[in-house]
């Protein structure tokens, strides 16, 4: 039960995280105009990874795409790449994890296969989350650098009476969405990896604390109280030492090769 819950929760958390990463990548508010120096502006600027927008106080918003690849800063390109890699990995991870879910049966898929798929998806989610966090952090660092540079240059060229106030940008909503989403994907990935350990057949834990072997050689495995009798035919020996309490994780509809240890 705990393994299924952990796996299911990991999947849901990762799903929310990846949806958040996609949302953050598409959002226009990666950087927003800093109004501290000009709180009375009737024009509000904000920028995303793909376009920049201007919202007039009159209610009109105009967005223009960055219709150039070569003319864009390398850092912006790097952030785009990180976010896209994060989305792609996350999407593949989601696809893999759907088939890995314990509550979903696909033919006679073995537990080891599900365990491997859970681990794979978990790693993918972790990398996806890290990509998103890295992308957002790189962009945030770029903003901080530009912010202080523009602050230093804010009143340059003040020829007499004329003031030219340079537009400064600060953190936009997308950065926070990206950080949270990346974190959720990362947590989801960790949960999937933890669930994988519980799914692996050699790590199945039984609730019983004593085992009396009746003949044959008995090998105790440190991961729990599962005994290997050395025979390949005694299916009746499987799961009779659970203290009578069965959990959903321990109920198998179909026998796999791991039922015959």
């Amino acid at each position: 039960m705990a393994v299924t819950a952990c796996q299911g929760l990991g999947f849901v958390v990762s799903l929310i995280g990846i949806a958040g990463i996609i949302a953050a990548t598409c959002m226009d508010q990666w950087s927003t105009q800093d109004l501290y120096n000009n709180p009375v502006t009737a024009v509000f600027n904000y920028q995303g990874l793909w376009r920049s927008c201007v919202r007039e106080s009159s209610g009109f918003t105009e967005c223009r795409g960055y219709f150039t690849l070569l003319g864009l800063p390398a850092m912006l390109q790097a952030v785009r790449a990180l976010m896209i890699v994060g989305i792609v990995l996350g999407a593949i991870g989601l696809l893999v994890s759907i088939f890995a879910l314990k509550c979903i049966r696909i033919g006679s898929m073995e537990d080891s296969a599900k365990a491997n798929m859970t681990l794979t998806s978990g790693i993918m989610f972790i990398v996806s989350g890290l990509c998103a966090i890295a992308g957002v952090s790189v962009f945030a660092n770029m903003l901080v650098t530009n912010f202080w540079m523009s602050t230093a240059n804010m009143y340059t060229g003040m020829g007499g009476m004329v003031q030219t106030v340079q537009t400064r940008y600060t953190f936009g909503a997308a950065l926070f969405v990206g950080w949270v989403a990346g974190g959720l994907t990362l947590i989801g990935g960790v949960m999937m990896c933890i669930a994988c350990r519980g799914l692996a057949p050699e790590e199945t834990n039984y609730k019983a604390v004593s085992y009396h072997a009746s003949g044959h050689s008995v090998a105790y495995k440190p991961g729990g109280f599962k005994a290997s009798t050395g025979f390949g035919s005694n299916t009746k020996n499987k799961k009779i030492y659970d203290g009578g309490a069965r959990t959903e994780d321990e109920v198998q509809s179909y026998p796999s090769k791991h039922d015959y240890v």
């Epitope: 105009q33 000009n38 009375v40 502006t41 009737a42 024009v43 600027n45 904000y46 920028q47 920049s52 927008c53 201007v54 007039e56 106080s57 009159s58 209610g59 009109f60 105009e62 223009r64 004329v162 003031q163 030219t164 106030v165 340079q166 537009t167």
Partner: antibody
Framework: QIQLVQSGPELKRPGETVRISCKAS????????MHWVQKMAGKGLKWLGW????????KYAEDFKGRFAFSLDTSGSDAYLQIGNLKYEDAATYFC???????????WGQGTSVTVSS | DIVMTQSPSSLTVTAGEKVTMTCKSS????????????LTWYQQKPGQPPKLLIY???TRESGVPDRFTGSGSGTDFTLTINTVQAEDLAVYYC?????????FGGGTKLELR
């Protein structure tokens, strides 16, 4: 077509209160900010402020804070300018205007003349 | 506050002439986000409300004759009327639409000789 129709001329005594209305039609009232502009005889235009017709929040120019108040009746697409404790120097023509692209005032009311006389 | 200064305050012209009036702002009205200047020109005839002529310093409002041209950037702006006609006699105002308060210039009165 877009129209802003203002109430008729007002003759008031100093210290009294005047309320000017501006009825909008031909556009979605709650999507366009409503501005108020003062034109004194022989003088230029002065921006009083505006009301966000979506939120109802008014914004006043520094010179017009206190006695001047903007209000709305969104159900009837009406904007109001109320001037309390009238002074002689408030005698002017007041225009309401709709905000448009480029933050420009693209449609104007015909103006309401306020005369302050004892 | 941004101070808008218009010059000249009045202008006497002959019909058919080309007229140029200027508007200076104490701060730049250029918005870096879209590279547009938030300066607007209005025409006000006696007994009438102002009429929008030009926004974004150079974009003509629909229905405005093409003899009206707006130009300039940053702090210096110009309204040009090619071949002035009798119906162009009015007061012309520029307005800062970049930051609050949305200040107007003092106006330029156009009169016929």
């Amino acid at each position: 077509q877009i129209q802003l129709v203002q109430s008729g001329p007002e003759l008031k005594r100093p210290g009294e209160t005047v309320r000017i209305s501006c009825k909008a039609s031909g556009f979605t009232f709650t999507t366009a900010g409503m501005h108020w502009v003062q034109k004194m005889a022989g003088k230029g235009l002065k921006w009083l402020g505006w009301t966000n017709t979506h939120s109802g929040e008014p914004k006043y120019a520094e010179d017009f804070k206190g006695r001047f108040a903007f209000s709305l009746d969104t159900s009837g697409s009406d904007a109001y300018l109320q001037i309390g404790n009238l002074k002689y120097e408030d005698a002017a023509t007041y225009f309401c205007a709709k905000w448009g692209r480029g933050n420009a005032l693209d449609y104007w009311g015909q103006g309401t003349s306020v005369t302050v006389s004892s | 506050d941004i101070v808008m200064t218009q010059s000249p305050s009045s202008l006497t012209v002959t019909a058919g002439e080309k007229v140029t009036m200027t508007c200076k702002s104490s701060q730049s009205l250029l918005n870096s986000g879209n590279q547009k200047n938030y300066l607007t020109w209005y025409q006000q005839k006696p007994g009438q409300p102002p009429k929008l002529l030009i926004y974004w310093a150079s974009t003509r409002e629909s229905g405005v004759p093409d003899r009206f041209t707006g130009s300039g950037s940053g702090t210096d702006f110009t309204l040009t009327i090619n071949t002035v006609q009798a119906e162009d006699l009015a007061v012309y105002y520029c307005q800062n639409t970049y930051s609050y308060p949305l200040t107007f210039g003092g106006g330029t009165k156009l009169e016929l000789r």
